[in-house]
């Protein structure tokens, strides 16, 4: 049992919560925090919103964002993507891992009318070592951040 | 464990085509993107271009964009490449790869 | 497309030296996400490439830390610290930045 314990303590595992900086504007993944609060990172590292992978093996990675908005965003495509996205070491390009679409504003009938959605994604990979994991929103205006409870990351090895 | 496996040597003659396959174990190969890369005997690598098994999307190198033509099954967990209209140049060692593992090669012979 | 060159083409080494590899490429390797995607790989005799530092330095999975990669840009260099039995074969430095990738001629370490 002690074996057992020990062991499991030293699984990869992180999670990271959403902070006033997560939104950046860019079309960059969200950003996150990594230490204050509930966030923490044990076995991952943490480089420009991406958790990165020490130890290769099988992580359940999830994430969930906290939609919001009053009425319909002008120039708001019909759907927001919110995905988990794979980097690897060769490519720039980015591979999708998990992705969900929202269509929040085709319930906003009013201009006026508060709403608010959420979206969770989880799921097991195989992950290697020196591979990124991101979190993509779009339409990033629409994700709301409150004390870190609401939109978060995270993953750990199973 | 992580497998690239790929098909036999193939001997085959001029003006003919032939299709390689590369056969993924060992992890889901939706989230790999699989490069094809040719070596001539004693000679160094020749990038031909990449394809997302998932989406289907590819790249290629423009030197080769008349000659090879990469595809994938998902449901095999398969990549292929087809190479048309072979010369004595096209023979080489053709492998597949991730971006961290290489397959074995596939030997090609052109020849009458 | 870039051409990437390698240097020396051929190494003649006695087991325990200290050895460097060095790559040039014609343009830039920086992409705009931040990143430089320039990497080494070994082959050894009859056998498929292997990668060995992917991102300029960082050792992948397995590879001992007598190798070492460093640069930036256009200029890169491998470094092995004592070379041992199991490091002959063929170096290669390769760019994924840009499209196509390309690879740099090789460099093989022999014992003299």
């Known amino acids: 049992l002690i074996q057992e314990r020990r062991s499991h303590e030293v699984n990869p595992a992180a999670h990271l919560t959403g902070a006033n900086s997560s939104l950046t504007g860019s079309g960059g993944p969200l950003l996150w925090e990594t230490q204050l609060g509930l966030a923490f990172l044990r076995g991952l590292s943490y480089h420009d919103g991406a958790l990165v992978v020490t130890k290769a093996g099988y992580y359940y990675i999830y994430s969930k964002v906290q939609l919001g908005g009053v009425g319909c965003p002008l120039g708001l495509a019909s759907t927001i993507t919110h995905g988990l996205y794979k980097r690897t070491p060769r490519y720039p390009e980015e591979l999708e891992l998990l992705v969900s679409q929202q269509s929040p504003c085709g319930r906003a009938t009013s201009s006026s009318r508060v709403w608010w959605d959420s979206s969770f994604l989880g799921g097991v990979v195989h992950l290697e070592a020196g591979e990124k994991v991101v979190v993509r929103v779009l339409d990033e205006r629409l994700v709301r951040l409150r004390d870190g409870t609401r939109s978060y990351f995270g993953a750990f090895m199973v | 464990q992580v497998q690239l496996q790929q098909s036999g040597a193939e001997l085959v003659r001029p003006g003919t085509s032939v299709q390689v396959s590369c056969k993924a174990s060992g992890y889901s190969f939706t989230t790999y993107l699989i490069e094809w890369i040719k070596q001539r005997p004693g000679q160094g690598l020749e990038w031909i271009g990449v394809i997302n098994p998932g989406t289907g999307e590819t790249k290629y190198n423009e030197n080769f964009r008349a000659k090879a033509i990469m595809t994938a099954d998902k449901y095999s967990s398969t990549a292929y490449m087809q190479l048309s209209s072979l010369t004595a140049d096209d023979s080489a060692v053709y492998f597949c790869a991730r971006w961290d593992r290489w397959g074995q090669g596939t030997t090609l012979t052109v020849s009458s | 497309d870039v051409v990437m060159t390698q240097a020396p083409l051929s190494l003649p080494v006695s087991l325990g030296d200290q050895v460097s590899i060095s790559c040039r490429s014609s343009q830039n390797l920086v992409h705009s996400n931040g990143n430089t995607y320039f990497h080494w790989y070994l082959q050894k005799p009859g056998q498929s490439p292997e990668l060995l530092i992917y991102k300029v330095s960082n050792r992948f999975s397995g590879v001992p830390d007598r190798f070492s990669g460093s640069g930036s840009g256009t200029d890169f260099t491998l470094k092995i610290s004592r070379v041992e039995a199991e490091d002959l074969g063929v170096y290669f430095c390769?760019?994924?930045?840009?499209?196509?990738?390309?690879f740099g001629g090789g460099t093989k370490l022999e014992i003299k």
């Open positions: 390769s760019q994924s930045t840009h499209v196509p990738y390309t």
